[in-house]
């Protein structure tokens, strides 16, 4: 059956032979209606990439550099299955390219000029492409030929496989630049030995190199890693201090109509029958015909790449930056230490319009990028299409798990001038009901619920976390009879109450009328029994404070708070009647952009912050007629975080624990991708 067939692309006679054997052996173990293998032979991996894009083949396994080529237009391929190494219990699908130095040296990443460098080999990922790609814009001009620019940047190097005649400085630390183990400084162990012997000041290797060469922790403690933010960390902190995370070997397919489920079904069955130590007749991860045919011989199995993970996310911002610099050879005109405009990520068109107005008023210091959901915005910040946005705590958690960092906190209670340096305790997550109802915290089952959005703190994580510990399952859509929780599955009962309009029904952005704090309260006013919001929501939308038709006649006393002990209290008493304290919303960014974002935002709030009194004829950053566009409307200022500069420290142990527990109920495709 052609639609059940996976056309595997082979790049040599030997691969084609193994592919035919793969095809025949899979036929013998799979049912006739199951997936089948067909083999397509091409001259090179690039030809395979083109063939898949043209729908002449379906899959091929590629090294990281080729995954980058496969992702570029017009190919537009995406990773679907990853090879893993090590054990099934602790599968390794990535390695980390690192810069190792001796602990007793005193320079940082931005002080490498004039140092001596040790590389694994010319053109190799960890030893050359990544470090030189990331340093590319610091190299002296002209940057071509690249070897000459590198020779002039370092004071001496060992770059195995380089041309020692044309570029003698690259072979200064290893005469002749031998391209095999005859050169004592060749490859990973050699580059590390070059550093260890004192020949070089820095070695560009894999994170595992240090552990493979130094079994003794005391010896390893003599070395450190250089981080991209110009700090240092110990060698076992490579996950937080590396030049790039590099995928090892990956199966790619078309982004649209790519048969990824079929490819996974095929490879999953293949590893069951012909994986490591499974069969004498045919081995997936070895071959009598040659090395690394179709798959790496060192692979132990396959893992499905989460569907939300596109090539940009899979390869990572640092890796793509390095490879793009090397390939395109272009550098920004401004020096790299100068802050370029900050690209703010706006949710849908309401936020985009406010962002555009901010952009005009900032004289272009702010630029705007749009996405339809918060998770799409986070992904854009991760891959460099955007730089920053302000997020509810639930999304600060997801952003943190995806490698972003909190930069500034929204403050709601501290009057100026102390505001900028004050760390507030947070706001209260509350459950609001109509005074006329007889609801309590203990009889919510079967009622109609209103939520700000799935994954947000007051509207979801806190109430559903508390509910989970009571009901011990994740079927929240069965607990409530119906509700509006934007971001839920469209056919879920938790989308039934949403107002839309139609194509935007239950979407987690302002196009859905019941989205956010104000939206969830409106949902309660018009349709629901209980709304999960922040403690300020009712006062901010009653007594004529919200001029919209649905809100202008609402009275604060017509609403009450549910307390966890089963009682109810006035909305004026949130301190004595709340579900939990929630961390304030915070601005997040990539680590490399955090300082620029902070500096620019502090400057912008001085011009457009809460000191502006007349928002009808001036631009106000923290005002959007109760719509909470870009920032919460009740923000007084954006405040420095001081030492709370990681998502764990910012959110606090208790909240992180609560969200981590809720992860078993997670519907976040982005979180799944970021924890792959």
């Amino acid at each position: 059956v052609p639609e059940k067939s996976v056309r595997w692309c082979a790049v040599s006679e030997h691969e084609a032979t193994k592919c035919q054997s793969f095809r025949d052996h899979m036929k013998s173990v799979l049912p006739s209606n199951g997936p089948s293998v067909a083999c397509v032979k091409k001259a090179s991996h690039l030809d395979c990439i083109r063939a898949i894009a043209a729908n002449e083949a379906d899959a091929v396994t590629l090294d990281a550099g080729l995954v980058y080529d496969a992702y570029l237009a017009p190919n537009n391929l995406k990773p679907v299955v990853a090879e893993f190494y090590g054990s099934k219990e602790d599968p390794q699908t990535f390695y980390y390219a690192v810069a190792v130095v001796k602990k007793d040296s005193d320079f940082q990443m931005n002080q490498l000029r004039g140092r001596k460098s040790c590389h694994t080999g010319l053109g190799r990922s960890a030893g050359w492409n990544i470090p030189i790609g990331l340093l590319y814009c610091d190299l002296p001009e002209p940057r071509k030929p690249l070897e000459k620019a590198v020779a002039n940047f370092f004071s001496g190097s060992c770059v195995p496989c380089a041309d020692g005649t044309d570029f003698p400085q690259l072979c200064q630390l290893c005469p002749g630049c031998g391209c095999s183990t005859l050169n004592q400084y060749f490859s990973y162990s050699g580059a590390f030995k070059c550093l260890k012997d004192g020949a070089g000041d820095v070695a560009f290797v894999k994170h595992s190199t240090i552990f493979e060469n130094l079994a003794n922790k005391a010896d390893r403690d003599q070395y450190e890693l250089l981080c991209l933010d110009n700090t240092r960390k110990s060698v076992d902190e490579y996950k937080d201090c590396h030049l790039a995370r590099v995928p090892s070997h990956t199966v790619v397919a078309r982004s649209v109509g790519g048969k990824e489920d079929l490819i996974w079904e095929l490879l999953n069955q293949a590893q069951e029958h012909f994986g490591k130590d499974k069969s004498k007749e045919f081995q997936l991860f070895s071959s009598p015909h040659g090395k690394d045919l179709l798959f790496k011989d060192s692979a132990h199995g396959f893992l499905k790449v989460p569907p939300r993970m596109d090539a940009k996310m899979y390869l990572g911002y640092e890796y793509i930056t390095a490879i793009r610099n090397l390939r395109e050879g272009t550098c920004p005109e401004a020096p790299t230490d100068e802050c370029k405009p900050v690209k703010w990520c706006a949710l849908s068109h309401h936020e985009r319009l406010k962002c555009d107005e901010w952009s005009v008023n900032s004289a272009g210091k702010i630029e705007c990028e749009s996405a339809e959901t918060t998770e799409d915005c986070i992904a854009k910040i991760m891959n460099g299409e955007a730089d920053a946005m302000s997020l509810d705590g639930g999304f600060v958690y997801i952003a943190g798990m995806c490698g972003l960092v909190p930069v500034l906190a929204e403050n709601y209670n501290t009057p100026n001038p102390n505001c900028e340096n004050t760390a507030e305790e947070g706001y209260f997550a509350v459950a609001v009901v109509k005074s006329s109802s007889d609801l309590t915290w203990d009889n919510l089952k079967g009622k109609k619920s209103c939520h700000t959005a799935v994954g947000r703190t007051a509207g979801w994580n806190i109430p559903m976390g508390l509910l989970y510990s009571k009901i011990n399952h994740c079927r929240f859509d069965e607990f409530f009879s119906e509700g509006c929780a934007p971001g839920s599955e469209k056919n879920s009962s938790l989308c039934k109450l949403c107002m839309g309009p139609s194509p935007n029904l239950c979407e987690p952005n302002n196009k859905e009328g019941y989205y956010g704090y104000t939206g969830a309260f409106r949902c309660l006013v018009e349709k629901g029994d209980v709304a999960f919001v922040k403690h300020q929501t009712v006062p901010q939308n009653t007594g004529g404070k919200n001029p919209d038709a649905w809100a202008k006649n609402l009275k604060e006393e017509d609403y009450e708070l549910l307390c966890l002990d089963g009682s109810r209290k006035s909305v004026q008493e949130p301190a004595n009647c709340h579900l939990a304290r929630a961390p304030n919303h915070a601005v997040v960014a990539r680590k490399d952009k955090a300082d620029c974002v902070q500096t620019l935002l502090l400057d912008q709030q001085r011009m457009f912050g809460s000191s502006v009194t007349d928002c009808s004829s001036n631009f106000c950053l923290f005002e959007s007629k109760t719509k909470d566009l870009l920032f919460r409307d009740d923000t007084v200022c954006l405040a420095k975080l001081h030492d709370r500069n990681t998502y764990e420290k910012y959110l606090g142990e208790e909240y992180v624990k609560a969200v981590t527990n809720l992860r078993k109920c997670s519907t976040s495709p982005l979180l799944e991708a970021c924890t792959f």
Partner: nanobody, 117 residues
Framework: QVQLVESGGGLVQPGGSLRLSCAAS????????MAWYRQAPGKQRELVAG???????TYAGSVKGRFTISRDNAKNTVYLQMNSLKPEDTAVYYC???????????WGQGTQVTVSS
Amino acid sequence: QVQLVESGGGLVQPGGSLRLSCAASGSIASINTMAWYRQAPGKQRELVAGITRSGTTTYAGSVKGRFTISRDNAKNTVYLQMNSLKPEDTAVYYCTDYSSSYYQDYWGQGTQVTVSS
């Protein structure tokens, strides 16, 4: 809330010029930010240029150096001078004062600009 009416569009050859006008039904002196947007078929509406009351201007990267936004508060009009026009500038051009945009997508009729040989 003032009504805005766009005019000045038309068919022009590549390399040619046009001047768009946006006339307001009331005073724009107290309006902080005025801007021109455009929307090409099948594309999202995008900011082309903006101007604040104090005269601060911002331009989309694709029009920098070719387009100039200005405002005449006495005439309650905002202008967009478009030079060195390219086929990719073809779109409906809209003017906004941002006053109602936080509530709903309120836009006027716009004015069609077509750049073609």
